[in-house]
Interface confidence: medium
């Protein structure tokens, strides 16, 4: 018959906040200052993120979790975990290579971040434009033209929306 035995990795006993120190006979050593391990069984600790410059600290680093950053006023986060900080613009604008620029006609941005998006095309839903769009606000769609009382007029709807990924230049 074949006898099997399981050899447990001694490092698996090292909890979060420690690392398995090969230089000390695989003893669980605490993470050094400014480092952390968020899971058990780690052979190294990760260096804590430092929130410098336009980044500011939202959550301090601990032995078991990384620091979390956000952005100083006038900037906003981009990407996962606030990878980058980007300058705010005004509503009705978007950030371009040449700085903040007004949204092109037919597009809007109701926030200080992000890009100008096309006005809703009310006619795609068989509706009419009840309130015109602006650089800061989308159009408001109302009842379909057929539902309007005689003599009522509707504004000509804007051009169809862009495909995903495009931005007005």
């Amino acid at each position: 018959f074949e006898r099997t035995r399981s050899l447990q990795d001694p490092c698996s006993n090292c909890p979060a906040g420690t690392f398995c120190d090969n230089n000390r006979n695989q003893i669980c050593s605490p993470c050094p200052p400014n480092s952390f391990s968020s899971a058990g069984g780690q052979r190294t600790c990760d260096i804590c993120r430092q929130c410098k410059g336009v980044f500011r600290t939202r959550k301090e680093c601990s032995s078991t979790s990384n620091a979390e950053c956000d952005c100083t006023p006038g900037f906003h986060c981009l990407g996962a975990g606030c990878s980058m900080c980007e300058q705010d613009c005004k509503q009705g604008q978007e950030l371009t290579k040449k700085g903040c620029k007004d949204c092109c006609f037919g597009t809007f941005n109701d926030q200080k971040r992000g890009i100008c998006r096309p006005w809703t095309n009310c006619s795609l839903d068989g509706k009419s434009v009840l309130v015109n769009g602006t650089k800061e606000r989308d159009v408001v769609c109302g009842p379909s033209p057929a539902d309007l009382s005689p003599g009522a007029s509707s504004v000509t709807p804007p051009a169809p929306a862009r495909e995903p990924g495009h931005s007005p230049q």
């Epitope: 981009l78 290579k97 890009i115 998006r117």
Partner: nanobody
């Protein structure tokens, strides 16, 4: 439904080149990113490009990697030159929605740099 699908990963020798692609659908994206995660390491930022062409790179890839975007095809690219062993990782495409309030992720493509 938002979908980001990466392709172009593979095995390459040190000093070689690869071009990664990411096909995007389902939303308007203000910014698209490349991140990477090496075995046993934290995920790290590589590069991003905005819808109007502004780009940025991590220090470790500056001068070697080039990000680009074809808005007509809704596709993101990463041209990787002078590859090093330390570039070995799963490379992820990510994208922020038009309001920079949500980040979407692809499934990743493995790049292995080895002789």
């Amino acid at each position: 439904q938002v979908q980001l699908v990466e392709s172009g990963g593979g095995l390459v020798q040190p000093g070689g080149s690869l071009r990664l692609s990411c096909s995007a659908s389902g939303d308007i994206f203000s910014i698209m990113f490349w991140y990477r995660q090496a075995p046993g390491k934290q995920r790290e930022y590589v590069s991003h490009i905005t819808s109007n062409g502004r780009t940025n790179y991590a220090d470790s890839v500056t001068g070697r990697f080039t990000i680009s975007r074809d808005n007509s095809k809704n596709t993101l690219y990463l041209q990787m030159n002078s590859l090093r062993a330390e570039d070995t990782a799963v490379y992820y495409c990510a994208a922020d929605d038009a309001t920079n309030t949500r980040t979407y992720w692809g499934q990743g493509t493995l790049v292995t740099v080895s002789s």
